[in-house]
């Protein structure tokens, strides 16, 4: 099929980047500028994305491939390719309707993007609190109460960062 | 006028440092591709690199490592700081703005040169 | 890297003449070449683009032309203005996210 398709189409021999100019007694013609074709025998060229806005330019539009945009700083990538901008919260937030909001008591966010999420209930693995979980951090599990021998020396969670959390027991 | 002029040019010694400024008029340099070229005496020419308006900066891959480019926003003009010179670094430097948001050179300065010798 | 083949290296013409000169790359480049038009002691100054888009300002008696690997300048009829140096020079992405700008040898346009 394709070396039918190649005897009887003058357009499957125009290779990426070119488009098939049927104004030009269909030869093999540039995609012009802001405009690319990232696959040969095309009949037309595609119209390159422009990063406007919050969006900036991380590669620039060829005549075979897209532009790729990112977010300015403050703001991430979401969705495919990069299709929308959200805004960045501080660790210990996330992104509501009316803004960035600090993460409800027993929860954290330790990243700049995504929703706060419950500290890790250290009771469902037999074990104990070792450090107790901010807005920011996780709790950390230590070992069982069983696993501390008589007279062994417990250890002495440091001051919380912000408020002094406890794992839901 | 939409231009540009490079300065910071000179002789200096191999394995020494310099910084070439590129400042900019009649545009902003921050929405364009920025782009350093340099071309050896009788020799062709050679790109350097770009910081695109995104800020992203690329290099070709005899430039990476020693070479960094950067921009002042606030004083609209690019710089190249070398690093680790060697004699056959010794070329004029130009700047240029890219084209249609690309980065071909479209409009150029009128070069700077720099010599490694000792 | 992608390598540019340029030739010829020189050619000697007359004022009326047609003159070519061809870029061949390594590798298939889309349409992703400019030309460049370089006078002695001066700066270079862009020709096209995009293999065939004429920039701002450039006399159409210039034009581009190609895609893929081989790619040609063309000066309808050579002016005496236009004896002077010209350079190809390819963009190339590569996966790595490296960028290749490639420039040609170069083609000295010498009066016959």
């Known amino acids: 099929f394709e070396r039918t398709r190649s005897l009887q189409d003058p357009c499957s021999n125009c290779p990426a980047g070119t488009f098939c100019d049927n104004n030009r007694n269909q030869i093999c013609s540039p995609c012009p500028p802001n405009s690319f074709s990232s696959a040969g025998g095309q009949r037309t060229c595609d119209i390159c994305r422009q990063c406007k806005g919050v969006f900036r330019t991380r590669k620039e539009c060829s005549s075979t491939s897209n532009a790729e945009c990112d977010c300015t700083p403050g703001f991430h990538c979401l969705g495919a390719g990069c299709s929308m901008c959200e805004q960045d919260c501080k660790q210990g937030q996330e992104l509501t309707k009316k803004g960035c909001k600090d993460c409800c008591f027993g929860t954290f966010n330790d990243q700049k993007r995504g929703i706060c999420r419950p500290w890790t209930n250290c009771s469902l693995d037999g074990k104990s609190v070792l450090v107790n979980g901010t807005k920011e951090r996780d709790v950390v599990c230590g070992p069982s109460p069983a696993d501390l021998s008589p007279g062994a020396s417990s250890v002495t969670p440091p001051a919380p960062a912000r408020e002094p959390g406890h794992s839901p027991q | 006028e939409v231009q540009l002029v490079e300065s910071g040019g000179g002789l200096v010694q191999p394995g020494g440092s310099l910084r070439l400024s590129c400042a900019a008029s009649g545009f902003t340099i921050s929405s364009h591709h920025m782009i350093w070229v340099r071309q050896a005496p009788g020799k062709g020419l050679q790109y350097i690199g770009f910081i695109n308006d995104g800020d992203y900066t690329y290099y070709t891959n005899s430039a990476k490592g020693r070479f960094t480019i950067s921009r002042d926003n606030s004083k609209n003009t690019l710089y190249l700081q070398m690093n680790s010179l060697r004699a056959e670094d010794t070329a004029v430097y130009y700047c240029?703005?890219?084209?249609?948001?690309?980065?071909?050179?479209?409009?150029w300065g009128q070069g700077t040169l720099v010599t490694v010798s000792s | 890297d992608v390598v540019m083949t340029q030739s010829p290296s020189s050619v000697s013409a007359s004022v009326g003449d047609r003159v070519t000169i061809t870029c061949q790359a390594s590798?298939?480049?889309?349409?992703?070449l400019a030309w460049y038009q370089q006078k002695p002691g001066k700066a270079p100054k862009l020709l096209i683009y995009?293999?065939?888009t004429l920039a701002s300002g450039v006399p159409s008696r210039f034009s581009g032309s190609g895609s893929g690997t081989d790619f040609t300048l063309t000066i309808s009829s050579l002016q005496p203005e236009d004896f002077a140096t010209y350079y190809c020079?390819?963009?190339?992405?590569?996966?790595?996210?490296?960028?290749?700008?490639?420039f040609g040898g170069g083609t000295k346009v010498e009066i016959k």
């Open positions: 995009r293999a065939s």
């Open positions: 020079q390819a963009i190339y992405y590569g996966t790595d996210d490296v960028i290749y700008h490639t």
């Open positions: 240029a703005r890219g084209v249609d948001g690309t980065s071909y050179p479209g409009l």
């Open positions: 590798q298939s480049i889309g349409a992703d």
